[in-house]
């Protein structure tokens, strides 16, 4: 239910596009320590034909909850660019049933403070990585949009 | 348009080991998520393993020390191999792609495998 | 595991006639403002079809007859006016947790 504006790309390349690349830029670093297993939103959320509307929405939902995460204001700035950029390019009409969103990552059972700090560590890394991808997807699919491929 | 083509199925003594495949064509093969789902005679459906675009895995915990799920994105196909092979293992394997909300977009026709001695 | 449980196992239907399948899930599919539920069609000796996903999404290329409703635990297909290509066997099918589960399946015959 999204009738994706702004498909001849200028609003996508002058604004979304640069801000998806500070980003990734800022994230260089992060790759190589990331696990291989697979995160449950791109099991479930894909950038497929005919459905690139429903995964760029969803991916711009799971954005927002990546804000004031990272320290930088930079950071944050170019993250919400994304978010509501997409959300407003994409013009979509039917809003998905609002529900509480899901925290980022699961709670941990009280360990000591060394332990702790380790798994903070973990999680930060995880969610950095989740990130990291999320961006990747969300530039790809526009890309597919804007290429105008409808591939199955 | 998307295609998948089991292949490997037959008759096979219990205990006996068997691989199946599954070429694709039609899509980004290396782009997807792909899953093995199986059917006995006149049953219903039962979800075995999927493999994801990393080459990470999932099992159905049920048939995770017998079969194992693989693909090889340069011949864009899909594999599972079977191991101590059962007489309840009779039924139509089929590969499918992964969908939008984790479902089963795209099927192929099955290969039968009939464990028997 | 989560269970699913299909009603009826099967019915009678005549063309025209307003069909609803229901699937009760052992526990909620629904996870972060979605329900992973989707329904296939299956024919004898064929591959099933995939109708519908996410609940309620209407899968490309499938009649608008065909419509999904539900979220948590309570699902239904419906088939608005049955055609007679509609005779066959519907499973539903949960995606929120691994081991992805279906349920027993609906024969829709013809009476």
């Known amino acids: 239910d999204c009738d994706i504006e702004g498909k001849d790309g200028k609003q996508y390349e002058s604004v979304l596009m640069v801000s998806i690349d500070q980003l990734l830029d800022s994230m260089k670093e992060i790759g190589s320590n990331c696990l291989n297993n697979e995160f449950n939103f791109f099991k479930r959320h894909i950038c497929d034909a005919n459905k690139e509307g429903m995964f760029l929405f969803r991916a711009a939902r799971k954005l927002r909850q990546f804000l004031k995460m990272n320290s930088t204001g930079d950071f944050d700035l170019h993250l919400l660019k994304v978010s509501e950029g997409t959300t407003i390019l994409l013009n979509c009409t039917g809003q998905v049933k609002g529900r509480k969103p899901a925290a980022l990552g699961e709670a941990q059972p009280t360990k000591s403070l060394e332990e702790n700090k380790s798994l903070k560590e973990q999680k930060k890394l995880n969610d950095l990585c989740f990130l990291k991808r999320l961006l990747q997807e969300i530039k790809t699919c526009w890309n597919k949009i804007l290429m105008g491929t409808k591939e199955h | 348009q998307v295609q998948l083509v089991e292949s490997g199925g037959g008759v096979v003594q219990p205990g006996r080991s068997l691989r199946l495949s599954c070429a694709a064509s039609?899509?980004?093969?290396?782009?997807?998520?792909l899953h093995w789902v199986r059917q006995a005679p006149g049953k219903g459906l039962e979800w075995l393993a999927a493999i994801w675009t990393g080459g990470s895995t999932d099992y159905n915990a049920e048939f995770s020390s017998r079969f194992t799920i693989s693909r090889d994105n340069s011949k864009n196909t899909l594999y599972l191999q079977m191991n101590s092979l059962r007489a309840e293992d009779t039924a139509v394997y089929y590969c499918a792609r992964n969908g939008y909300g984790e479902s089963f977009a795209y099927w192929g026709q099955g290969t039968l495998v009939t464990v028997s001695s | 595991d989560i269970q699913m449980t299909q009603s009826p196992s099967s019915l009678s239907a005549s063309v025209g006639d307003r069909v609803t399948i229901t699937c009760k899930a052992s526990?909620?599919?629904?996870?972060?403002?979605?329900?992973?539920m989707n329904w296939y069609q299956q024919k004898p000796g064929k591959a099933p079809k995939l109708l519908i996903y996410m609940a309620s999404n209407l899968e490309s290329g499938v009649p608008a007859r065909f419509s999904g409703s539900g979220s948590g635990t309570d699902f239904t297909l419906t088939i608005s006016s049955l055609q007679p290509e509609d005779f066959a066997t519907y499973y539903c099918?949960?995606?929120?947790?691994?081991?992805?589960?279906f349920g027993g399946g609906t024969k829709v015959e013809i009476k």
């Open positions: 039609g899509f980004t093969f290396s782009s997807y998520g």
């Open positions: 526990h909620s599919v629904d996870d972060d403002g979605d329900s992973y």
């Open positions: 099918q949960q995606s929120n947790e691994d081991p992805l589960t």
